[in-house]
């Protein structure tokens, strides 16, 4: 398996009750506006064929896409949660900026691309769905990166 380096986050990032609560509240608010319950973004297909040691790198890719293509464009919605959660997630992204994989990451990019394609295909409702799954993103980052 490819070797990942600097793909670690301190567990203290996930032990802050206030921002954890706000992240989950944001996900809940968005999920109430999500009518497409058949489609899942963060689930077994995303992790399929990705070894445990590669998953932080995988989640870094998902986090960066979510920030750039979903949260920034939707930043005026779901207040006041959005204005607090986005900077928090951006800090996590920044801390993972040196997380890389040495070797072939094609299988990871393929899985991430499927997630991106699903969001793009669904348009705005895909963006809402991605926000509604921020709890899953948060927990996936925690499990994969600490």
């Amino acid at each position: 398996a490819p070797i990942s380096s600097h793909c670690r986050l301190d567990k203290s990032n996930f032990q802050q009750p206030y921002i954890t609560n706000r992240t989950f509240m944001l996900a809940k608010e968005a999920s109430l506006a999500d009518n497409n319950t058949d489609v899942r973004l963060i689930g077994e297909k995303l992790f399929h064929g990705v070894s445990m040691s590669e998953r932080c790198y995988l989640m870094k890719q998902v986090l960066n896409f979510t920030l750039e293509e979903v949260l920034f464009p939707q930043s005026d919605r779901f207040q006041p949660y959005m204005q607090e959660v986005v900077p928090f997630l951006a800090r996590l992204s920044n801390r993972l900026s040196t997380c890389h994989i040495e070797g072939d990451d094609l299988h990871i990019q393929r899985n991430v691309q499927k997630l991106k394609d699903t969001v793009k295909k669904l348009g705005e409702s895909g963006e809402i769905k991605a926000i509604g799954e921020l709890d899953l993103l948060f927990m996936s980052l925690r499990n994969a990166c600490i």
Epitope: S31, E44, F47, D135
Partner: antibody
Framework: EVQLVQSGAEVKKPGASVKVSCQAS????????IHWVRQTPGQGFEWMGW????????RYAQKFQGWVTMTRDMSNTTAYMELPRLRDDDTAVYYC????????????WGQGTLVTVSS | QSVLTQPPSVSVAPGKTATITCGGN??????VHWYQQRPGQAPVLVIY???DRPSGIPERFSGSRSGNTATLTISRVEAGDEADFYC???????????FGGGTKLTVL
Amino acid sequence: EVQLVQSGAEVKKPGASVKVSCQASGYTFSDYYIHWVRQTPGQGFEWMGWVNPDTGGTRYAQKFQGWVTMTRDMSNTTAYMELPRLRDDDTAVYYCARDLTGFDPFDIWGQGTLVTVSS
Amino acid sequence: QSVLTQPPSVSVAPGKTATITCGGNNFRNKRVHWYQQRPGQAPVLVIYYDSDRPSGIPERFSGSRSGNTATLTISRVEAGDEADFYCQVWDLFNDNGVFGGGTKLTVL
């Protein structure tokens, strides 16, 4: 064939400890979390926690925090669950089960280990 | 904390359809999984992510969700389907795996 095979039934006295093993085969051990779930007639199923075989990291349900210990041995693809200071109401069938992310469905279960606590 | 409520028992005649429900608070963005447990055996996953079916599980088993209720449906029920059925979700906020109390399916 993907399977989880657990150690045999145990009879323990109150205050004793028990260590249950769960040997995995048929898949890459390090790529799935191993969870422990117990089943009692009174409480039904209770999720106890998981161990990440790749790192040895653990996550315990609040009820079992500071009490249960979950470990793994990569060399023999085996996970362990240890409960010290057993009480009568710890009598249960203890299952190991695997999942992909730490919060996905349990797609494969062990056969269960009956632990009886009795004086 | 999430609490999942199931009916204690459901009875159905062979060849008919059995419906088992699982109700929960704050169900909206949780994914529901269903397990079948025959007497003296370990549970087996029969439905995951509300409605997906693992390979090897007959098409007679299906799952759905509406609001705060998830439903497991078994069509053309057979005697071998008699078992206890449990729903399960992950309560991510409280970091806990939560199970329903179980439903005993009796085939008349």
